[in-house]
Interface confidence: medium
């Protein structure tokens, strides 16, 4: 498994998630229904304090392709 | 274009260690993650450690866990491998290549490390 | 480990069509595309095939990948003395994000 090191922010966090989601896309909010903790973004949860990648996948627009 | 270019390899006794470098020029280091990916003799290849394009999740297989220890210095453009407790299984061609998302779209010409008493 | 299962070995005559085969799982080719390198002898190995079918620029169009379900397949047409060289394919773990390997197969040319 990939171990994390500190926090993401800025660029840093755009290019990690943009490699973990790949041509998926991201959000920066996830959706209500995907999350316990509505009011929580991404940048919250990575660069407020660290995150890893598992988390960083919940973010990702839309499920992996099969093709 | 694109060029990487390892060195740090040799001949080292069983519980030696190494350091392997990867030079990196001809494109944008801080926007790859980066890789090192070894063949032993007569064998396939194998992915040793990955490392996200600021250091920030690094990857390691099994086979070299709690033994080596990827780094990149972004300043220099360069990639590292430290290599300790090394053992005669870890004898092979180390190379360091760039990732892309699916695929390792550039290698270098590879650093033989040998581990043998 | 070897996670994506390759023929050991492949051979055809100069001119023939010669296909490799690359057999792996649901969390690798089955939701992952396939990347394919020819390693010539004494060399690095060189990306060939990248998403399943594309080729860098370069990689002659005598080279082509195909996918299906969990297996993918490389396609060489015109065989011809200097493909004479070891082949891997290459995937992605979905939720591991790392890559994965196939063992490798070498293809003679005959005569």
């Known amino acids: 498994a990939y171990r994390p090191s500190e926090t993401l922010c800025g660029g840093e966090l755009v290019d990690t998630l943009q490699f973990v989601c790949g041509d998926r896309g991201f959000y920066f909010s996830r959706p209500a229904s995907r999350v316990s903790r509505r009011s929580r973004g991404i940048v919250e949860e990575c660069c407020f304090r660290s995150c890893d990648l598992a988390l960083l996948e919940t973010y990702c627009a839309t499920p992996a392709k099969s093709e | 274009q694109v060029e990487l270019v390892e060195s740090g390899g040799g001949l080292v006794q069983p519980g030696g260690s190494l350091r392997l470098s990867c030079a990196a020029s001809g494109f944008t280091f801080t926007s790859y993650w980066m890789s090192w990916v070894r063949q032993a003799p007569g064998k396939g290849l194998e992915l040793v450690s990955s490392i996200t394009s600021y250091g920030s999740f690094t990857y390691y297989a099994d086979s070299v866990k709690g033994r080596f220890t990827i780094s990149r210095d972004n300043s220099k453009n360069t990639l590292y491998l430290q290599m300790n407790s090394l053992r005669a299984e870890d004898t092979a061609v180390y190379y360091c290549?760039?990732?892309?998302?699916?695929?390792?779209?550039?290698w270098g010409q590879g650093t033989l490390v040998t581990v043998s008493s | 480990d070897i996670v994506l299962t390759q023929p050991p070995s492949v051979s055809g005559a100069p001119g023939q069509r010669v296909t490799i085969s690359c057999s792996g799982s649901?969390?690798?080719?089955?939701?992952?595309?396939v990347s394919w390198y020819q390693q010539l002898p004494g060399t690095a190995p060189k990306l060939l095939i990248y998403d399943n079918s594309k080729r860098p620029s370069g990689v002659p169009d005598r080279f082509s990948g195909s996918k299906s379900g969990t297996s993918a397949s490389l396609a060489i047409t015109g065989l011809q003395s200097e493909d004479e060289a070891d082949y891997y394919c290459q995937s992605r773990d979905t939720y591991g994000y790392y890559w994965v390997f196939g063992g490798g197969t070498k293809l003679t040319v005959l005569g």
């Open positions: 649901s969390s690798n080719i089955g939701s992952n595309s």
């Open positions: 290549a760039r990732n892309m998302y699916t695929h390792f779209d550039s």
